[in-house]
C-alpha cells in the first residue's frame, strides 16, 4: 500500500471542519506529522502551519494493513478572514516522507455564503451560514 | 529486505570533487528518502544533507554551497557530489532510508 | 543549529550493571530524540525514536526518557554486546545534530 493524504470537509451547523487524513502502515504511523497549511504556496511545514498532529503507534491495532489518521481543524464560524488557498500535509524525518495534499480553497461570497473548491472527493462544495446545509 | 550500499573513489585529491553512489534495495526511492551522514576516523557523526520521496532536497548550511543531491529512481541510486573537497572532508560516508536503515559506509580519504 | 551535548563521554561498566547516558539539547526539542548505537566498524543502528520508543527488534533492557531539552539512554542489565560507541540525534530542528558520542566499555 502507498502511502497518501487526502484532503475534505463537513459542515455541522455553523461550523466548518477541515480534515486531512493520511493512510500508512500501522508501523509507519511513528515519526509522521500530519499539518494544515494556509496561503503557504512553498513553505508549508508543520511550523508554519494552522495546526499539526504527532502520530503514534497505536499497539493496540492488530494486522499490518493500511490505517488512516486524521487531523480536523475547526472553524466555529466562517468569516471573510478565512477566505485563503489551504492544503494538507504531512512528514516524517524518521522515515524521509514527505506528502503533498491537493491545494483548496474557501470563498466567502457577499451574501454571506463560502464555498469550498478543489477538494478531490467532492470538486465543489457550497455551504450556506443561513441554511446550514450541504448545497 | 532493505539494503543501501555507498560506492565511490577510495581516495580524492584536495580541491577536487568527490562522487559518491548510493544504490538501494528493498524498497523505492519514491516511496522513502535517502539521508546522507558522515563520519570523520574516530570522530562523531555529521548530518550532510536529504533527498526526500518527492525529490525535494535540503541541506546541512554548513556544507550547502558545496553540496548537491540527486537521484535516479529507475536506476534506485542516490547521489552525492561535494566540491572543494579539504583534508577536512576525510571521513566515512553513510547513506541512509530515513533515520532507520544504513549503509554500511565507504571510508573516503582526502589527500595529495 | 541546535548543540547536542551528551554526558559523559566514556563510561565503564560491569555486566549486569545498569547504565544511563544523557542528552542535553541546547533548546526545547519536543521528544524529537533518537538514540543510536555504533559498534566498531559497523554503521549505526537505530534503537529509540521520538525519546522513548523502542525500535523493532531492540531489546527492552533499553529504555529512553526525558523531555524539553533533557533526555537519558538507560541500559538495564548490562551485557557484552552491549559494548559500544551510543550517539543521541535531534532531528526537531533543521539541520539534525548529533551528540558527540558515549563510549561503553567493559569494566
Known amino acids: 500500500g502507498c502511502i497518501n493524504i487526502t484532503s475534505s470537509a463537513s459542515q455541522e451547523g455553523t461550523r466548518l471542519n477541515l480534515i486531512c487524513t493520511v493512510w500508512h502502515k500501522k508501523e509507519e504511523a511513528e515519526g509522521f506529522v500530519v499539518f494544515l497549511c494556509k496561503d503557504r504556496s512553498g513553505d508549508c511545514s508543520p511550523e508554519t502551519s494552522l495546526k499539526q498532529l504527532r502520530l503514534k503507534r497505536d499497539p493496540g491495532i492488530d494486522g499490518v494493513g493500511e490505517i488512516s489518521s486524521q487531523l480536523m481543524f475547526t472553524i466555529s464560524q466562517v468569516t471573510p478572514l478565512h477566505s485563503g488557498t489551504y492544503q494538507c500535509c504531512a512528514r516524517s524525518q524518521k522515515s524521509g516522507i514527505r506528502l503533498q495534499g491537493h491545494f483548496f480553497s474557501i470563498l466567502f461570497t457577499e451574501t454571506g455564503n463560502y464555498t469550498v473548491t478543489g477538494l478531490k472527493q467532492r470538486q465543489h462544495l457550497e455551504f450556506s451560514h443561513n441554511e446550514g446545509t450541504l448545497s | 529486505q532493505v539494503n543501501l550500499q555507498e560506492s565511490g573513489p577510495g581516495l580524492v585529491q584536495p580541491s577536487e570533487t568527490l562522487s559518491l553512489t548510493c544504490t538501494v534495495s528493498?524498497?523505492?526511492?519514491?516511496?522513502?528518502?535517502v539521508y546522507w551522514v558522515r563520519q570523520p576516523p574516530g570522530k562523531g557523526l555529521e548530518w550532510m544533507g536529504r533527498?526526500?520521496?518527492?525529490?525535494?532536497?535540503d541541506y546541512n548550511p554548513a556544507l550547502k554551497s558545496r553540496l548537491s543531491i540527486s537521484r535516479d529512481t529507475s536506476k534506485s541510486q542516490v547521489f552525492l557530489k561535494l566540491n572543494s573537497l579539504q583534508t577536512e572532508d576525510t571521513a566515512i560516508y553513510f547513506c541512509a532510508r530515513g533515520w532507520t536503515h544504513w549503509g554500511q559506509g565507504t571510508l573516503v580519504t582526502v589527500s595529495s | 543549529d541546535i548543540q547536542m551535548t551528551q554526558s559523559p563521554a566514556s563510561l565503564s561498566a560491569s555486566l549486569g550493571e545498569t547504565v544511563s547516558i544523557e542528552c542535553l539539547a541546547s533548546?526545547?526539542?519536543?521528544?524529537?530524540l533518537a538514540w543510536y548505537q555504533q559498534k566498531p566498524g559497523k554503521s549505526p543502528q537505530l534503537l529509540i525514536y521520538y525519546a522513548s520508543s523502542l525500535q523493532d527488534g531492540v531489546p527492552s533492557r533499553f529504555s529512553g526518557s526525558g523531555s524539553g531539552t533533557q533526555y537519558s539512554l538507560k541500559i538495564n542489565s548490562l551485557e557484552s554486546e552491549d559494548v559500544a560507541t551510543y550517539f543521541c540525534l535531534q532531528d526537531s530542528e533543521y539541520p539534525p545534530t548529533f551528540g558527540g558520542g558515549t563510549k561503553l566499555e567493559l569494566k
Open positions: 528493498g524498497f523505492s526511492l519514491t516511496s522513502y528518502g
Open positions: 533527498i526526500w520521496n518527492d525529490g525535494g532536497t
Open positions: 533548546e526545547d526539542i519536543y521528544n524529537n
